[in-house]
């Protein structure tokens, strides 16, 4: 029962992580105009995302525009885009794998196979979490590096945007959820091998073992 509870918690966390990741990737708030103390660096506030950039004028009017062409974009931005999309797709794949192996589904009947699928989904979610973490950390590193670089003009200095925090949360949730799903498996997975061991040993009397060596829980 505890195993099922952990599975549900794990998948809920990964779903939350996936939604967070989706919002993080979509929002144009990866890099935002820097503030120095309480004073804004310039009246023209800039937000930059993976897909578009926005400018909030001093009047409060906001303009956004999707990036014109893929090839004209900086390579790090292209890489971040790709990793974001791949991470989301990998997490979706993990969800499908989980659904196939979940305790409440009948896609796969065998308990061992179910356990293996849940373990696989957990690993896939962990991979998705790592893939989400890479562009977020890379972007954060670039922002911090430029912020303290005297050769970067003040107008071009940026701060960490809300999307990065969402990205970190998404990564954390995917890693945690995936980890929980991986942890639910030993209990389900260990039944299989030990069960076969017991059945094999009883059907082969030539192999003699001391009574203490048999896992007693497998005796009916």
């Amino acid at each position: 029962m505890a195993s099922a509870g952990m599975q549900i918690l794990g998948v809920v966390l990964t779903l939350l992580g996936w939604v967070n990741g989706l919002v993080s990737c979509a929002l144009p708030m990866w890099k935002v105009t820097a503030f120095i103390g309480n004073s804004i660096v310039v009246a023209q506030v800039v937000w930059e995302g993976l897909w578009m950039s926005c400018v909030v004028q001093s009047t409060g009017q906001m303009q956004c525009k999707v990036y014109d062409s893929l090839l004209a974009l900086p390579q790090d931005l292209q890489a971040a885009r790709a990793l974001c999309v791949i991470a989301l797709l990998v997490a979706l794949f993990g969800l499908l794998v989980y659904l196939a192996g979940a305790k409440c589904t009948t896609c796969v009947e065998e308990k061992d196979s179910k356990a293996r699928l849940v373990l696989t989904s957990g690993i896939v979610f962990v991979i998705s979490g790592v893939l989400t973490l890479i562009p977020v950390c890379w972007t954060a590193h670039a922002i911090i590096r430029d912020f303290y670089n005297p050769l970067v003009a003040e107008a071009q200095k940026r701060e960490l945007g809300a999307s990065l925090y969402l990205g970190w949360a998404a990564s954390g949730l995917l890693l945690l959820g995936g980890g929980l799903l991986c942890c639910t498996c030993p209990s389900g997975g260990s039944q299989g091998p030990s069960h076969y061991m017991a059945r094999y040993s009883t059907s082969a009397p030539a192999i003699s073992r001391g009574p203490s060596e048999y896992p007693t829980k497998n005796y009916v």
Epitope: I36, S39, Q44, S53, C54, C64, S69, P74, Q156
Partner: antibody, heavy 123, light 106 residues
Framework: EVQLVQSGAEVKKPGASVKVSCKAS????????MNWVRQAPGQGLEWMGE????????TYNQKFKARVTITRDTSTSTAYMELSSLRSEDTAVYYC????????????????WGQGTLVTVSS | DIQMTQSPSSLSASVGDRVTITCQAS??????LNWYQQKPGKAPKLLIY???KLEDGVPSRFSGSGSGTDFTFTISSLQPEDFATYYC????????FGQGTKVEIK
């Protein structure tokens, strides 16, 4: 219509200082950084520095840092560039230019320029 | 500091010719590069921003490409009004202009 109107030509003696003004109109002055660029006769363009009109903070080219001062007056939407300890090699046309952000490219450019102010340094 | 090496420093061409100017940065400037046209006695005019984006109102015969350290500016079919000096300008690290390329009539 965005316009940057600069002060008239100046003739200065070596060692003196010159202050060139740049009056902005047609946009929110405090919303865009103002840059200063110079061009010696028959030479290329050389960036000198920029000011954030919203805060007054400045960034200078190392080459001019000791001699240049960029200021602004938000009440008149005017930026100023003062160059001290003038030498004959400072004879040039001085331009002010607005920095703008280009949506869809994560890029900046100096999009509007003043007409230029010729400063002649001669003994 | 970033150095911008523009070449050639001057070139002679005829109306209708295809003209190519290159600009090389001493380190990567991403896509933070602009191209300007300057005519004698006039202020520079922005043609290309973000390495390849055409400024509004600029004829489509002008184009730019490149990213990182190597950039190219092209005039597909030179017109009489295109005889001028062209400058590249990086703004990844403060601002640095190339030395300029003077396009003259052959």
């Amino acid at each position: 219509e965005v316009q940057l109107v600069q002060s008239g030509a100046e003739v200065k003696k070596p060692g003196a200082s010159v202050k060139v003004s740049c009056k902005a109109s047609g946009y929110t002055f405090t919303g865009y950084y103002m840059n200063w660029v110079r061009q010696a006769p028959g030479q290329g363009l050389e960036w000198m520095g920029e000011i954030n009109p919203a805060t007054g903070s400045t960034t200078y080219n190392q080459k001019f840092k000791a001699r240049v001062t960029i200021t602004r007056d938000t009440s008149t939407s005017t930026a100023y560039m003062e160059l001290s300890s003038l030498r004959s090699e400072d004879t040039a046309v001085y331009y002010c230019a607005r920095r703008d952000y280009y949506l869809g490219s994560n890029s900046y450019a100096l999009d509007y320029w003043g007409q230029g102010t010729l400063v002649t340094v001669s003994s | 500091d970033i150095q911008m090496t523009q070449s050639p420093s001057s070139l002679s061409a005829s109306v209708g010719d295809r003209v190519t100017i290159t600009c090389q940065a001493s380190q990567s400037v991403s896509n933070n590069l602009n191209w300007y046209q300057q005519k004698p006695g006039k202020a520079p005019k922005l043609l290309i921003y973000g390495a390849s984006k055409l400024e509004d109102g600029v004829p489509s015969r002008f184009s730019g490409s490149g990213s990182g350290t190597d950039f190219t500016f092209t005039i597909s079919s030179l017109q009489p009004e295109d005889f001028a000096t062209y400058y590249c300008l990086q703004h990844r690290y403060l601002w640095t202009f190339g030395q300029g390329t003077k396009v003259e009539i052959k």
